[in-house]
Each structure stands twice: as structure tokens, then as C-alpha cells.
């Protein structure tokens, strides 16, 4: 998740104009730059799988790609939790796992990913466009939620699922503490860099690049550290509200994954591609800083006709309280 900026090694400043204050102004931007680059923006991915042998059986897998510690995961369907969605499972890394029908088995797969088997049969089964959402509460990033569903065209007859549309809801106000400091630092850094454009550049060691190079690197796409495409408070409108399902036995057999990472992969991928890695491929790089969106590369994918934007009615502290996040 983290990339390190190659910070130019600064020569001691020349006496005179720069002086002690000048030295501080030169070192500070690089310290802040390193912090900004290494901080990384958390990402949430969701994969929804429908079993071929049991069309009413779904497996939802969710993961959190961030440096913070996860304090709670909530899996819901029918939309985000607290916005019309119904909680299927709550997973706390230390307090335990709780689930309610039709969820059959919720579990931690790793320290940052979970899976949930959802089962039913007959008319009470969830239909293909049911929305499943995973909300990760973490410190210090706050709460991040991704939602996804199997597209209606994902029948077992298809060899590859359609390219998924990404969805992410971020409780930006919940990003406190360290994130706030970093945000301030990054803004201050940009301010300093802008001011430095109008000054003569400091003397650098010849083997290093100019100050502009690390700045460009910091905002360039990379596999190791890409900020998430954040569509705040987004969910899918679905006309199909799942009914309570009867518990059924799990079935093996082939399956089709619809994966909903926080980054869009703008090319169709077959089941083999999804099976090879739990972390989906990532596309354009988008940074979000307190609701301001900057982008390098391509435009973010449009939300499409099935998406609506709305504020979280419960506010940034929605994940706190008796669920163990205090």
C-alpha cells in the first residue's frame, strides 16, 4: 500500500538569503511530502459470487486495503447500513462475529478481509441485482464502505462477468487524528511548492532529480500506492429487496465472481482472473482530500443509471456506539 518518495538530499543552504529559516522551509516540504505519499488512501473491495449449482447461494468477500487497524466490519444488503440496508453480519476482530439469517457463515479470511456465505432457496432467494455492502471502520481512516451486486446478466451461462462498476461510500468526516494532520500537511506542502516555483531552486546533489520529480511521482499512478476512487455516500438502487431465506447446505462447483473494487478495471476479465487474486486490478488514480477530487490519468467511470448519491443520515459517528467502536 505504501510507496516511498525519493526525497532529494539537500545540500546545506548557502548563508545569506536562505539562512536557518530557509533550511527549515526546504526540509519541511520533503518531510510532509514523504508523509503524504506514504499515508496512502484506504481502499475497500467487494466480490460477490453466485454458486452455479445453487443459484440462491451467494458468497460475499470484502477486503480493506489501508494501513489503519480495522475495528469493525458490517455486511449489509439492500443498500448501505443505516440507509435502508439490513445488517447481515457484524465482525469485530477481537470481540467476535455475529450474523443473522440468511447469512450462514461469516468469517475472517485474513486480518483485513472477510467472507460471508448467504443462502436461500426458491422464491425467497435474493435476486441477481441485490446490493451487498461492506463497511470497514478503521483507525485512523474512519469508515469506508463499498457496495456491489451481481449484474442481472450474470447467468451461469456466461463465461465472464460484465465489468463491475465501483461503488464506495466514505464517511470523510470520520477521518480524524493523523489523517487530519496529514491533510493539513499536504495542503501546506502544495502551498510551499507553489511558493517555491517563484524562487531559485535549492542546490541539490547532482545525482538527484529536481523538486518537481518527486512531486510528480507522488501524484502518479502506481501499483503499490493508489488512492481510491471515492464516490461519497453512493449506493445502488435496487428494486429487488431480499426476503428472509431458508438455510441450505453449501454446494461446490464453478462460480462467477462480480468484483467491485474501489478502482474500476475498464476491461472485462474472466473468472480465472478473479480467482487468481483477491485484490482486483486497479485503474485510474484518484485522490480525495476532504471532498476535493484530483485525478491523474483517465476520468472516473460514471455512476450510471443505477446509482444514487445521498448523505449518510447517521453522520460520521454511525459506526460507533454499542457495536464495539468507541
Amino acid at each position: 500500500m505504501r510507496t516511498e518518495a525519493q526525497v532529494p538530499a539537500l545540500q546545506p543552504p548557502e548563508p545569506g538569503l536562505e539562512g536557518a529559516m530557509g533550511h527549515r522551509t526546504l526540509v519541511l516540504p520533503w518531510v510532509l511530502l514523504t508523509l503524504c505519499v506514504t499515508a496512502g488512501t484506504p481502499e475497500v473491495w467487494v466480490q460477490v459470487r453466485m454458486e452455479a449449482t445453487e443459484l440462491s447461494s451467494f458468497t460475499i468477500r470484502c477486503g480493506f486495503l489501508g494501513s489503519g487497524s480495522i475495528s469493525l466490519v458490517t455486511v449489509s444488503w439492500g443498500g448501505p447500513n443505516g440507509a435502508g440496508g439490513t445488517t447481515l453480519a457484524v465482525l469485530h476482530p477481537e470481540r467476535g462475529i455475529r450474523q443473522w439469517a440468511p447469512a450462514r457463515q461469516a468469517r475472517w479470511e485474513t486480518q483485513s478481509s472477510i467472507s460471508l456465505i448467504l443462502e436461500g432457496s426458491g422464491a425467497s432467494s435474493p435476486c441477481a441485482n441485490t446490493t451487498f455492502c461492506c463497511k470497514f471502520a478503521s483507525f485512523p481512516e474512519g469508515s469506508w464502505e463499498a457496495c456491489g451486486s451481481l449484474p442481472p446478466s450474470s447467468d451461469p451461462g456466461l463465461s465472464a462477468p460484465p465489468t463491475p462498476a465501483p461503488i464506495l461510500r466514505a464517511d470523510l468526516a470520520g477521518i480524524l487524528g493523523v489523517s487530519g494532520v496529514l491533510l493539513f500537511g499536504c495542503v501546506y506542502l502544495l502551498h510551499l511548492l507553489r511558493r517555491h516555483k517563484h524562487r531559485p531552486a535549492p542546490r541539490l546533489q547532482p545525482s538527484r532529480t529536481s523538486p518537481q520529480a518527486p512531486r510528480a511521482r507522488a501524484w502518479a499512478p502506481s501499483q503499490a500506492s493508489q488512492a481510491a476512487l471515492h464516490v461519497p455516500y453512493a449506493t445502488i438502487n435496487t428494486s429487488c429487496r431480499p426476503a428472509t431465506l431458508d438455510t441450505a447446505h453449501p454446494h461446490g462447483g464453478p462460480s462467477w465472481w462480480a468484483s467491485l473494487p474501489t478502482h474500476a478495471a475498464h476491461r472485462p476479465q474472466g473468472p480465472a482472473a478473479w480467482a487468481s487474486t483477491p485484490i482486483p486490478a486497479r485503474g485510474s488514480f484518484v485522490s480525495v482530500e476532504n471532498g476535493l477530487y484530483a485525478q491523474a490519468g483517465e476520468r472516473p467511470p460514471h455512476t450510471g443509471p443505477g446509482l444514487t448519491l445521498f448523505p449518510d443520515p447517521r453522520g460520521p459517528r454511525a459506526m460507533e456506539g454499542p457495536l464495539g467502536v468507541r
Partner: antibody, heavy 114, light 113 residues
Framework: EVQLQQSGPEVVKPGASVKISCKAS????????INWVKQSHGKSLEWIGD????????NYNQKFKGKATLTVDKSSGTAFMGLRSLTSEDSAVYYC???????WGQGTSLTVSS | DIVMTQSPSSLSVSAGEKVTMSCKSS????????????LAWYQQKPGQPPKLLIY???TRESGVPDRFTGSGSGTDFTLTISSVQAEDLAVYYC?????????FGGGTRLEIK
């Protein structure tokens, strides 16, 4: 801070039914998933079940299936536990607690006596 | 169901002494996915509801004095009170938080001499 306020003590006759309540306050009730726990006099604790306020979904300890019924009224922020066909074995203090048992109600004493 | 067995059933110590109590589960409470043990400890004082002390086998609930320490993994767990105070007079319960039904141990009654 979350507070769980339970209904008062009950004295009922054998064979009767009773419904005890647990009112949550201090936060959004839709975040509350309530557990119910039984403690017979001088004995240990037994988990009865839990309820999901989003849709009234429940999990029960097999031992209490048919004995306890858990319900919720989202509008008033109150969870209920009904107990039927009461016998002296059901005489106990019943507690409600939040999802991970980090907050508890004060307990409701139930005495079944003829 | 997972059976939780606590020992001793009661113990009497003087204020300032160190005390340990044991809890054994019939099945492992270790979650293989994240390597966490789903075991909780509660303190119940006379006439009061239980109070959560420890979760995840070793994490103290906020506000719990640091003289309370939980340890152990898998099926064997221990609650240690490093220096018993008069207000620690209570019954201590361990609980399986791993799988439903969430069973409790029989309790260890702590008395102060």
C-alpha cells in the same frame, strides 16, 4: 453513553406468559443488536439469543427455542423478550446486553410462583 | 455447544496479593483467519449486572484498571489480578465469544480475607 433500561420485576403464576422490555437510549437504536441473558439465583449466566433491529432477525440458543421469543420495536427503541409456559425453572434475573456484551441492562427479576 | 470450565470455583486472598483464575474451553476459541481468540472475561459484583473486563482474551475494555490481565490461547485462558483490591470482591466469568451459543463458564468467586 449507551444505556439499557429494563422493565420492573415480575411475579407470575406457573403456565402463564410474560414479556419483559429493554429500552435503549443514548445512541441510534438501529445500531443496537440486543442479547438476552438468563441468570438463575446464585448460578452462572446463560445466553438466550440475540435480535437484529434492522429486520427483527434472531438467533436463539437451542435450549430456549420455544421458551423465549425476541422482538423489537424500532420506533420506540425497545427490545422485548416474551417467555411462555412458565415454570419455577424460569425464575431468574434476565438481562439485556448490547451486541458484544459491553453494556448491560440492570436486570429484570422474574419469579414464577403459585 | 462449547463448554467453558472455570477453576477454582472460589478463592480467598488478602488485599495486595496476586490472583490467577483459569478458564478452559472444550473447543478452540482461536479464529484462524485473523489469529484472534474470541474469549471474554466479566466481573459481576453482588446485586449488579456483569461488567465486561477483557475481550479477545487479552484486550482490556476501556476504563478497566491495568491490574486486570487476560492471557492464553486456543483452549486455555487465564485472568490475573496483579494486586487485589477490596473492590475486586466479585464473581468472574469467562465466555465463549467464538460461536453460538455464547456459553459462559460457571464462575470463580473471589473473596477478600
Amino acid at each position: 453513553e449507551v444505556q439499557l433500561q429494563q422493565s420492573g420485576p415480575e411475579v407470575v403464576k406457573p403456565g402463564a406468559s410474560v414479556k419483559i422490555s429493554c429500552k435503549a437510549s443514548g445512541n441510534t437504536f438501529t445500531d443496537y443488536f440486543i442479547n438476552w441473558v438468563k441468570q438463575s439465583h446464585g448460578k452462572s449466566l446463560e445466553w438466550i439469543g440475540d435480535i437484529n433491529p434492522d429486520n427483527g432477525g434472531t438467533n436463539y440458543n437451542q435450549k430456549f427455542k420455544g421458551k423465549a421469543t425476541l422482538t423489537v420495536d424500532k420506533s420506540s427503541g425497545t427490545a422485548f423478550m416474551g417467555l411462555r409456559s412458565l415454570t419455577s425453572e424460569d425464575s431468574a434475573v434476565y438481562y439485556c446486553a448490547t451486541l458484544y456484551f459491553d453494556y448491560w441492562g440492570q436486570g429484570t427479576s422474574l419469579t414464577v410462583s403459585s | 455447544d462449547i463448554v467453558m470450565t472455570q477453576s477454582p470455583s472460589s478463592l480467598s486472598v488478602s488485599a495486595g496479593e496476586k490472583v490467577t483464575m483459569s478458564c478452559k474451553s472444550s473447543q478452540s476459541l482461536l479464529n484462524s483467519g485473523n489469529q484472534k481468540n474470541y474469549l471474554a472475561w466479566y466481573q459481576q459484583k453482588p446485586g449488579q449486572p456483569p461488567k465486561l473486563l477483557i475481550y479477545g482474551a487479552s484486550t482490556r475494555e476501556s476504563g478497566v484498571p491495568d491490574r486486570f490481565t487476560g492471557s492464553g490461547s486456543g483452549t486455555d485462558f487465564t485472568l490475573t489480578i496483579s494486586s487485589v483490591q477490596a473492590e475486586d470482591l466479585a464473581v468472574y466469568y469467562c465466555q465463549n465469544a467464538h460461536s453460538s451459543p455464547y456459553t459462559f463458564g460457571g464462575g470463580t468467586r473471589l473473596e477478600i480475607k
